[in-house]
């Protein structure tokens, strides 16, 4: 939620006997972080550790295969999106620890908090691309045999990244640092000031393009894929269903609180009690969305273990099996194991 969403304690209890010293907190509670902020910090720490290590490993595994394996291209791009977002976490973590004080300057304020939105759009667009690929493999195998290649996959990824950057621009442009007079604090957020309509438009576009439309299209897409898969009695269809549900669900589950509070805040009066309550929950909603940045490697590993019984292989080789297996298109009606399995992997980044 891009609004200035940081709440500080009220200072209504002074009398003339109090001493107002900038070097010591005047409010008794001002050194204590709120529970939502503490939870956000815990989530950020876990996401950073798992996200950086896990996605770095995924990048390392897929980078070597990306020249020849289309699935590796998809997973490489998703991992890069996640990895980039995770790099902002130490700064966001530091800011929350300092009660949302932002000592990092205007440029960092514009760029770093926007990374999670870039991740959201890049991931959902890449996911849409991957889903289209899965769909074509099932329903247009001949076309895939003729045209499905690494070059086209890279072009599709480039288009996804370009669109993601475009969609992130509004939030990026409206991000500003504001120095509050008392308590002395620099805050980083977006300020639409006179333009409440534009704020609402940005929130609606984000909800529709980053959540509702993908939810609808991906649900339809995977419904068709799974129906076809079942009708052909493809192997591992039950396992596939479970993983695909996990895959699609995770993106929407982890973005849901952010999207709901974001749209609500854009329609509420900024001084209303509900708005102020939602502001207090903002860091938690952002951190919850950030879970998407570390969930991919976890699902890859879980899926890899599931498909191979027990974890006998090393982590890189297990990931290599899951992420770089190429879908072989056959003219026969049978649906290949790799098509089912790779579809089953977590293909969402955010």
């Amino acid at each position: 939620m891009d609004s200035f969403n940081y709440t500080t304690p009220d200072y209504g209890h002074y009398d003339d006997k109090d001493t107002l010293d900038l070097n010591t907190p005047v409010d008794k509670t001002s050194n204590t972080l709120r529970v939502p902020d503490i939870l956000a910090l815990v989530i950020f720490a876990v996401v950073f550790l798992v996200g950086v290590l896990g996605n770095a490993l995924v990048v390392w595994v897929t980078a070597f295969e990306a020249k020849r394996t289309i699935n590796a291209i998809w997973f490489l791009n998703l991992a890069v999106a996640d990895f980039l977002s995770c790099l902002a976490l130490p700064i966001l973590f530091t800011s929350i620890v300092q009660h949302h004080h932002w000592p990092f300057g205007g440029a960092a304020c514009s760029i770093l908090p926007s990374l999670i939105l870039l991740n959201m759009y890049a991931s959902i667009l890449l996911l849409a691309t991957i889903s289209a690929d899965r769909f074509l493999l099932v329903f247009k195998p001949i076309w895939c045999q003729n045209f499905r290649g690494a070059g086209l996959a890279w072009i599709a990824c480039a288009v996804a990244w370009g669109l993601a950057l475009l969609l992130t621009i509004p939030s990026f442009l409206y991000r500003v640092v504001r120095e509050e007079y008392f308590p002395p604090k620099v805050l980083c957020g977006v300020d639409y000031s006179h333009d409440k309509r534009r704020e609402r438009a940005v929130a609606i576009v984000r909800l529709v393009l980053g959540f509702l439309w993908p939810l609808l299209t991906l649900t339809i897409c995977y419904t068709f894929i799974l129906l076809r898969t079942w009708s052909r009695r493809a192997t591992r269809s039950t396992k596939t269903l479970k993983v695909v549900v996990a895959v699609v669900a995770s993106f929407f589950i982890f973005w849901l609180p952010y999207q709901v509070t974001g749209i609500m805040m854009s329609f509420l009066e900024p001084s209303s009690p509900t708005f102020l309550l939602l502001k207090k929950l903002d860091s938690l909603c952002v951190s919850f969305a950030y879970i998407n940045c570390c969930i991919n490697p976890i699902i890859y590993v879980v899926a890899g273990q599931g498909f191979q019984g027990r974890l006998r292989k090393s982590l890189p080789s297990l990931l290599r099996n899951v992420l770089t297996e190429e879908s072989v298109v056959r003219e026969s009606k049978s649906f290949t194991r790799s098509t089912v399995d790779t579809m089953a992997q977590k293909t969402q980044a955010v």
Epitope: Y11, L20, L22, N23, Y181, K185, L187, Y192
Partner: antibody, heavy 125, light 112 residues
Framework: QVQLQQSRAALAKPGASVKLSCKAS????????LHWVKQRPGQGLEWIGY????????KYNQNFKNRATLTTDSSSSTAFIHLSGLTYEDFAVYYC??????????????????WGQGTILTVSS | DVVMTQTPLSLPVSLGDHASISCRSS???????????LHWYLQKPGQSPKLLIY???NRFSGVPDRFSGSGSGTDFTLKISRVEAEDLGVYFC?????????FGSGTKLEVK
């Protein structure tokens, strides 16, 4: 009662420096921040900065940062503003103003409840 | 910096009339604690400014109830229900949400 006593007038040459004073009485001097505000003839008000008398912490408007220095002397309950490199643009009335710690349910030192009567600074060669 | 724009610059009134002064800020004045730190001062000729209204709508001690303030975010209004002779002077709005603190250019309330 609370009073902020300022010298009536000051005269200085362009390029010179001047130190204006503001003597507080009627309250505990170290308990309230003191702000300085500039008003050019027939113009609006411009905030210069504030000082916290208990620890000498001061915050400035960037427009004045290099030319204004705020200090206090707790023993005499007096605040000072030192203006250097004076130009004709500095010809103005300078007010000191106090912020409350609390007033009727407000939150912190946000508004000026008492003002000095102002010092007219004339810059002339 | 937050620019405070007051309208009108001059407001001719008859005594007993209702008066309204508008103040618009270039940025939202909503503090992170939810308050709008927008205040109103009156300056009479040859005097220092005096506080009338603080934090949008709170009357300072001794200020008559004919003065009222309202607004939020970027748009604020000071209303005087029945103008009296002692109300004449220049009215300034001021914000203390953000650094630097800034003032409006002033509205001169004068007799028609």
């Amino acid at each position: 009662q609370v009073q902020l006593q300022q010298s009536r007038a000051a005269l200085a040459k362009p390029g010179a420096s001047v130190k204006l004073s503001c003597k507080a009485s009627g309250y505990t001097f170290t308990n309230h921040w003191l702000h300085w505000v500039k008003q050019r003839p027939g113009q609006g008000l411009e905030w210069i900065g504030y000082i916290n008398p208990i620890n000498g912490f001061s915050k400035y408007n960037q427009n004045f940062k290099n030319r204004a220095t705020l200090t206090t002397d707790s023993s005499s309950s007096t605040a000072f503003i030192h203006l250097s490199g004076l130009t004709y643009e500095d010809f103005a009335v300078y007010y000191c103003a106090r912020v409350p710690l609390s007033y009727g349910g407000s939150y912190g030192p946000y508004f000026f409840d008492f003002w000095g009567q102002g010092t007219i600074l004339t810059v002339s060669s | 910096d937050v620019v405070m724009t007051q309208t009108p610059l001059s407001l001719p009134v008859s005594l007993g009339d209702h008066a309204s002064i508008s103040c618009r800020s270039s940025q939202s004045l909503i503090h992170s604690n939810g308050n709008n730190y927008l205040h109103w001062y009156l300056q009479k000729p040859g005097q220092s400014p005096k506080l009338l209204i603080y934090t949008v709508s709170n009357r300072f001690s001794g200020v008559p109830d004919r003065f009222s303030g309202s607004g939020s975010g970027t748009d604020f209004t000071l209303k005087i229900s029945r103008v009296e002779a002692e109300d004449l002077g220049v009215y300034f709005c001021s914000q203390s949400t953000l650094v630097p603190l800034t003032f409006g250019s002033g509205t001169k309330l004068e007799v028609k």
